[in-house]
């Protein structure tokens, strides 16, 4: 806390400008009006304030808005956002995607901080669902964002938003998350033709059931081994050798390199040796 002291004569701030960088902390506290600061927040980022000075500015805003900052202030916080705690952010009501983008920009290039996680949580909860524009924005800043959500949170993603998802956005998703996302993707892409459909659905197939894999095996899709390795073990086990051969097409030879790894190992173990021998890969059940 900065001690309350009277502002020295002639030092009262008329606007937020570079002259303030020469003010001591107590002078900032005494001479900068909180309401002025709030209306001119957009100027703060252009001024090279020290961390200590930013602490004072934050303190002034906290006093002015004890129930939480209005969005007009939040949108222009800039680097002052880095001074906010998750507890501060929980008081906010952020509804504008532009505000969200502005604050994410401040943290760009860094891992998702607790502050950013809280901000996103508040924003998404306020919207009621993870719409396409929000998902586009979040995955642009944090490619792993989608996979950081719980299956329960993912259930609020409407199928229409799935169009915004890129393959790399799903890299770190686990089976429980893909179990939720796959049916949404299937719904979103249902009107596409065979080859186009496979291109779009491929990265979601870690949530596909056996019957869908069997159907794909009849469509000459030539699934690559990287995709096959991400399939659910329980979905792969019932596939016959012939079905796996059709599913993988020319990539079937890659099974040999993966024979010690799941789910290939689990599948091999449950096949008849005679059937495996038809592949000519030397796989041992």
């Amino acid at each position: 806390e900065v001690e309350k002291t009277a502002c020295p004569s002639g030092k009262k701030a008329r606007e937020i400008d570079e002259s303030l960088i020469f003010y001591k902390k107590w002078e900032l506290e005494a001479c900068v009006d909180a309401a002025l600061l709030a209306t001119q927040m957009d100027r703060v980022n252009a001024i090279p304030f020290t961390y200590e000075q930013l602490d004072v500015l934050k303190h002034k805003l906290d006093e002015l808005y004890p129930q939480g900052y209005p969005e007009s202030v939040i949108q222009h916080l800039g680097y002052l956002f880095l001074k906010m705690s998750p507890e501060d952010i929980r008081k906010w009501n952020v509804t504008s995607l532009e505000t969200l983008k502005a604050l994410l920009e401040v943290n760009k290039g860094h891992e998702m901080s607790p502050q950013v996680a809280t901000l996103i949580d508040r924003f998404v909860k306020g919207r009621g669902q993870l719409d396409k524009d929000t998902l586009d924005t979040l995955t642009a800043f944090y490619p792993g964002y989608l996979c950081s959500l719980s299956p329960e949170e993912l259930s609020s993603v409407p199928p229409s938003s799935i169009w915004a998802v890129r393959p790399q956005d799903l890299d770190t998703c686990d089976p429980r998350q893909l179990d939720v996302l796959y049916p949404k993707a299937r719904l979103a892409f249902q009107n596409m033709n065979g080859s186009e459909y496979f291109v779009k659905i491929q990265s979601f197939l870690g949530g596909a059931p056996t019957e869908d894999l069997k159907a794909l095996s009849q469509q000459n899709v030539s699934m690559d081994l990287a995709t096959f390795m991400k399939l659910r073990t329980d979905a792969v086990l019932p596939l016959t050798v012939a079905e796996v051969q059709k599913l993988l097409g020319p990539h079937v030879e890659g099974l040999k390199a993966e024979e010690r790894h799941r789910p290939v190992r689990d599948w091999i173990l449950r096949q008849r040796q005679d059937d495996l021998d038809t592949l000519g890969l030397g796989l041992q059940g």
Epitope: D174, P175, R176, M229, K230, T233, D234, L237, R260, H261, R262, R265, D266, L269, R270, Q284, G285
Partner: antibody, heavy 119, light 107 residues
Framework: QVQLQESGPGLVKPSETLSLTCTVS??????????WSWIRQPPGKGLEWIGY???????NYNPSLKSRVTISVDTSKNQFSLKLSSVTAADTAVYYC???????????WGQGTMVTVSS | DIQMTQSPSSLSASVGDRVTITCRAS??????VNWYQQKPGKAPKLLIY???SLQSGVPSRFSGSGSGTDFTLTISSLQPEDFATYYC?????????FGGGTKVEIK
């Protein structure tokens, strides 16, 4: 409810073969989804996987023990067994049998049996 | 073989504390990592499978996360019955391997 029970001698002489059997009750050793493993734990130390068997007879062993280990299955008795040859004092441990359910992990364990290698 | 390195090897904590144990694989194990709890003189008990799935009957204060090479077991609020040794295990490669264990002791 599947239960596992290890049995076998608690004392084995150096250079001899350690033999243990695990009896499966409340379920079948021929289950499609299950592998049957042996795991050991030397006194005061961590867990070491020895190997597994599928009801078809397919096996897989820890490379560090492979030359000395044989795991077999007897579907008629609903049992699987471990043989570890040329034992030394370093093989003294609690030996556990466990079910490896394909969709999870070692979800059911025997209570363990202490085997001491000493002359 | 995939080596599993657990840290810390031991920790002291109080009832109600949030406890985090990490496990690092020497190469990718995808999400095929399980966590076990073992109490003295007892067989291990499966807590978490496939990195983040809670085994049936295990309290929800236990959670797992991670994929690839880095995995975490978290106990959100430590209870008296949670003082035990915890092990991670990978089953991605055919040669299963366990971490060295983390002993959680009372502070």
């Amino acid at each position: 409810q599947v239960q596992l029970q290890e049995s076998g001698p608690g004392l084995v002489k150096p250079s001899e073969t350690l033999s243990l059997t695990c009896t499966v009750s409340g379920g079948s050793v021929s289950s499609y989804h299950d592998l049957w493993s042996w795991i050991r734990q030397p006194p005061g130390k961590g867990l070491e996987w020895i190997g597994y068997i599928y009801y078809s007879g397919s096996t897989n062993y820890n490379p560090s023990l492979k030359s000395r280990v044989t795991i077999s299955v007897d579907t008629s008795k609903n049992q699987f067994s471990l043989k570890l040859s040329s034992v030394t004092a370093a093989d003294t441990a609690v030996y556990y049998c466990a079910r490896d359910f394909v969709l999870s992990g070692f979800d059911i364990w025997g209570q363990g049996t202490m085997v001491t290698v000493s002359s | 073989d995939i080596q599993m390195t657990q840290s810390p090897s031991s920790l002291s904590a109080s009832v109600g504390d949030r406890v985090t144990i990490t496990c690092r694989a020497s190469q990718s194990s995808r999400y095929y990592v399980n966590w076990y709890q073992q109490k003295p003189g007892k067989a291990p008990k499966l807590l978490i499978y496939a990195a983040s799935s809670l085994q049936s009957g295990v309290p929800s204060r236990f959670s797992g996360s991670g994929s690839g090479t880095d995995f975490t077991l978290t106990i959100s609020s430590l209870q008296p019955e949670d003082f035990a040794t915890y092990y991670c295990q990978q089953s991605y490669d055919a040669s299963y391997t366990f971490g060295g264990g983390t002993k959680v002791e009372i502070k």
